[in-house]
């Protein structure tokens, strides 16, 4: 929902969290603002207090229940409002009818680990976190490897077009330090976006055997 210079963007993590960011030029930093969630077919309402993240933007997480509980479905619509205190009253600053499964952003993959490392290749696995069982296998991943002397932005993206929670990196340089990250995205949802990148996993390839051709 956009009103002039106001922008209100929320994503559902597919289980029990709706994360929201509200941006407004010229808004007062010390004003108390809340995001209010009103589902169309649930018996609960939920609020979270918006906290400043920059000069003109605020964020909060609507925590709907235990992390792995399935609190919303594909048919739910949640009316989300930003309300800010003006004296003794609360003013609606932004509003949207939010379709959770059209606005997905999963949690970053976790538990990255090196399964097997050699001189030129490394097998890495990971797990997805708090992802709905509704997706079954309809997920895709992107991965990137940080090489010495390069930045993450320069790293080529490797795309896995299926639910595959491992990768075998090849053509690596022996005895070299690398870092690896992965992110995940459901195939469902018009406004669905990539998860944040995972925490980087550092690993080192094995040195080439002495006297052998590499």
């Amino acid at each position: 929902a956009v009103n002039g210079t106001s922008q209100f963007t929320c994503f559902y993590n597919s289980r029990a969290n709706i994360s929201c960011v509200w941006s407004q030029d010229g808004a007062l930093q010390d004003t108390s603002c809340q995001v209010h969630a009103w589902p169309d077919r649930r018996r609960w309402n939920q609020t979270c207090e918006l906290l400043p993240v920059s000069q003109a933007s605020w964020a909060c997480n609507l925590i709907l229940g235990a992390p792995d509980s399935q609190k919303l479905t594909t048919v739910d619509i949640v009316t989300l409002r930003v309300l800010c205190r003006e004296g003794v009253r609360w003013r609606v600053m932004a509003i949207q009818d939010f379709k959770p499964f059209e606005n997905l952003r999963l949690m970053a993959p976790i538990s990255l680990q090196v399964v097997h490392v050699e001189t030129h290749r490394c097998n890495i696995s990971w797990e997805i976190s708090q992802a709905s069982h509704y997706f079954e296998r309809h997920l895709e991943f992107e991965a990137r490897t940080l090489s010495p002397g390069h930045t993450w932005e320069e790293a080529p993206l490797l795309t896995l077009k299926q639910k595959q929670e491992w990768i075998c990196l090849e053509t690596l340089t022996p005895d070299t330090q690398y870092e690896f990250q992965v992110r995940v995205k459901p195939l469902q949802g018009e406004f669905t976006t990539w998860s944040p990148w995972s925490q980087p996993l550092a690993f080192r390839t094995k040195p080439a055997a002495l006297g052998k051709d590499t």
Partner: nanobody, 123 residues
Framework: EVQLVESGGGLVQAGGSLRLSCVVS????????MAWFRQAPRKEREFVAV????????EYVDSVKGRFTVSRDNAKNTVYLQMNNLKPEDTAVYYC????????????????WGQGTQVTVSS
């Protein structure tokens, strides 16, 4: 189902202090806006203080402003009410309340409640 257990009440002389605690279990604590209410004999239950899910914003009934401080520790699933400069008219049973909706918590109806802790202020 969320459960709330208060503690810290007691008998204190006017001008004294007490710190009430309320431990929350059975659900994710940071979902909840937390509040303190009190009920004096033969009176309605009244709102005392509220603290938002983040702990950043607090509000108080006029009669306790400057004397009472509400706070929360999200790591300990606990909300506190620090009561200073107590007056005989603060005598009541103090109740901890939880609601996932900040805008509903003062209305009493849909809150989860603790069992209450007695505070008696003698003159």
């Amino acid at each position: 189902e969320v459960q709330l257990v208060e503690s810290g009440g007691g008998l204190v002389q006017a001008g004294g202090s007490l710190r009430l605690s309320c431990v929350v279990s059975g659900d994710v604590f940071v979902r909840y806006t937390m509040a303190w209410f009190r009920q004096a004999p033969r009176k309605e239950r009244e709102f005392v203080a509220v603290v938002t899910d983040s702990g950043r914003t607090t509000e108080y009934v006029d009669s306790v402003k400057g004397r009472f401080t509400v706070s929360r520790d999200n790591a300990k699933n606990t909300v506190y009410l620090q009561m200073n400069n107590l007056k005989p008219e603060d005598t009541a049973v103090y109740y901890c309340a939880a609601n996932t909706d900040y805008f509903q918590i003062r209305s009493v109806d849909n809150n989860a409640w603790g069992q209450g802790t007695q505070v008696t202020v003698s003159s």
